[in-house]
Interface confidence: low
């Protein structure tokens, strides 16, 4: 009679995480008498997966009834597969012995590969805000997927980005993998409503990629533009000067009026108006009593936006002329108007 052979017909089996893996094994003879054991790995370090004779293996069930005398099917099912279950599984026939059974013949092995979905991509931006025209970096991370092949794309408002670097770890064989990508994005003044999207496509996702998003509103700082104008006279000896603070983001803004370098009033932006692009406008006004000044007055609107160094715009108010004559002046006509940083 021909010597018993252990047949493992499947060289490899691919199973999705969470599903059940069927590892097939048949023997060609009932002789010699003895149990079957399943191992993961070969050699002295192999891991016992199932022992027909004894032990408790809650995740393993047999395909056939191994208690039947003429059974030669030793296939097993392993439930709730995880990436950690990946490896080569060997079906091994033992010959009944005393005191211990003796290993008789092993199957050729079945490589179990686990398809595991990537975790939802997590996109994170820079720790500090940046202004338009600056380049900022966004990172995208996704973990726990298998096999290693994966595609990652970056988008800004639906437009695909090309300036990014992606690494998949580990480089060698592993039960599951992680992806890390860093994209560079150039900010524009219109980016308050913009979104950066990281899209991950993997065989386990069946054509429905996972996306992670970051709002550029968390990243961008749009500095304000200032315009100081002199309004028509409200009353005799009184001039109304306004400071238009336009196109800024975020809202956090403090404005200080200076008369000849002395602080006149400080206020915080509250009732702002929002522009279509998500930036804000705000206006502050100062009523100046011209009769209280003997000389020309330099009025400065100084703005501190989002904790940044202050910017300012000045307006020269000539007290020698009659206030009514000055009412028609615009900022453009004020050659003394200037912008500077206050440190």
């Amino acid at each position: 009679e021909e010597e018993l052979q252990v047949i493992q017909p499947d060289k490899s089996v691919l199973v999705a995480a969470g599903e059940t893996a069927t590892l097939r094994c048949t023997a060609t003879s009932l002789i010699p008498v003895g149990p079957i054991q399943w191992f993961r790995g070969a050699g002295p370090g192999r891991e016992l997966i199932y022992n027909q004779k004894e032990g408790h293996f809650p995740r393993v069930t047999t395909v056939s009834d191994l208690t039947k005398r003429n059974n030669m099917d030793f296939s097993i099912r392993i439930g709730n597969i995880t990436p950690a279950d990946a490896g080569t599984y060997y079906c091994v026939k033992f010959r009944k012995g005393s005191p211990d059974d003796v290993e008789f013949k092993s199957g050729a092995g079945t490589e179990l590969s686990v398809r595991a979905k990537p975790s939802a991509p997590v996109v994170s931006g820079p720790a500090a805000r940046a202004t338009p025209q600056h380049t900022v970096s966004f990172t995208c991370e996704s973990h726990g997927f298998s096999p290693r092949d994966i595609t990652l794309k970056w988008f800004k408002n639906g437009n695909e980005l090309s300036d990014f670097q992606t690494n998949v770890d580990p480089v060698g064989e592993s039960v599951s993998y992680s992806i890390h990508s860093t994209a560079k994005v150039v900010l524009t003044r219109e980016d308050v409503h913009s979104q950066v999207i990281c899209e991950v496509a993997h065989v386990t996702l069946q054509g429905d990629p996972l996306r992670g998003t970051a709002n550029l509103s968390e990243t961008i700082r749009v500095p304000p533009t200032l315009e100081v104008t002199q309004q028509p006279v409200r009353a005799e000896n009184q001039v109304n000067v306004t400071c238009q603070v336009r196109k800024f983001y975020p809202q956090r803004l403090q404005l200080t009026w200076l008369e000849n370098g002395n602080v006149s009033r400080t206020e915080t932006a509250s009732t702002v108006t929002e522009n279509k692009d998500g930036t804000y406008n705000w206006m502050s006004w100062l009523l100046v009593n011209v009769s209280a000044h003997r000389d020309d007055v330099k009025l400065t609107c100084q703005v501190e936006h989002d904790g940044q160094p202050a910017v300012s715009k000045s307006h020269d108010l000539k007290v020698s002329a009659h206030p009514k004559e000055q009412g028609s002046n615009t900022a453009a006509e004020n050659t003394g108007s200037n912008e500077r940083n206050i440190y």
């Epitope: 993961r40 016992l48 726990g144 580990p170 060698g172 592993s174 039960v175």
Partner: antibody, heavy 116, light 108 residues
Framework: VQLVESGGGLVQPGGSLRLSCTAS????????MSWVRQAPGEGLEWVSA???????YYTDSVKGRFTISRDNSKNTLYLQMNSLRAEDTAIYYC???????????WGLGTLVTVSS | EIVLTQSPGTLSVSPGERVTLTCRAS??????IAWYQQKPGQAPRLLIY???SRATGIPGRFSGSGSGTEFTLTITSLQSEDFAVYYC??????????FGGGTKVEIK
Amino acid sequence: VQLVESGGGLVQPGGSLRLSCTASGFTFRNYGMSWVRQAPGEGLEWVSASSGSGSTYYTDSVKGRFTISRDNSKNTLYLQMNSLRAEDTAIYYCAKVTWNNFFDYWGLGTLVTVSS
Amino acid sequence: EIVLTQSPGTLSVSPGERVTLTCRASQGIAGKIAWYQQKPGQAPRLLIYDASSRATGIPGRFSGSGSGTEFTLTITSLQSEDFAVYYCQQHYDWSPLTFGGGTKVEIK
């Protein structure tokens, strides 16, 4: 990635101490964090861990005495140590735990001395 | 608890030599082993994870291998900066995570 521990010092047996670890350079809330200690002249011993989701894990010798916690808004990991014993004397390292349960970044450590 | 036994405890070698450190686990850990290097007065530094994957920035002279219960860390040509204590750690089981006792690599 940077991890900075603080809060170590000399404490009497039975006393308490709270260690802090401030993290930067990565998205703190997404990662597991851990405390690993090293007694003078000895090897490394894992003490406790907190997963990104907030689940907590302890080695048997500190269960019931130590409490790990985290404040994701402050990027800070804590270890509240009560009923301290002489055998708790060690350098306590804060470490970032990868998704695969090893430690890819470590702080410089803070020394805890339990002595009367 | 998974117990890790490192051998030898101390290894005296000369620069340029090949070094092999062993870490044995008390049960199968599915290749979930990490190796760390620790120099005096410093924190440990990750070298290898998943038994054979090199961590970021680790020179190619460091390599890991093994499966089941026996794992090795090999340094092909020992440099002066490699004299340190090396620890293995299993990252297979959380309850608890365990380290080996360490192997000190010293100058002969």
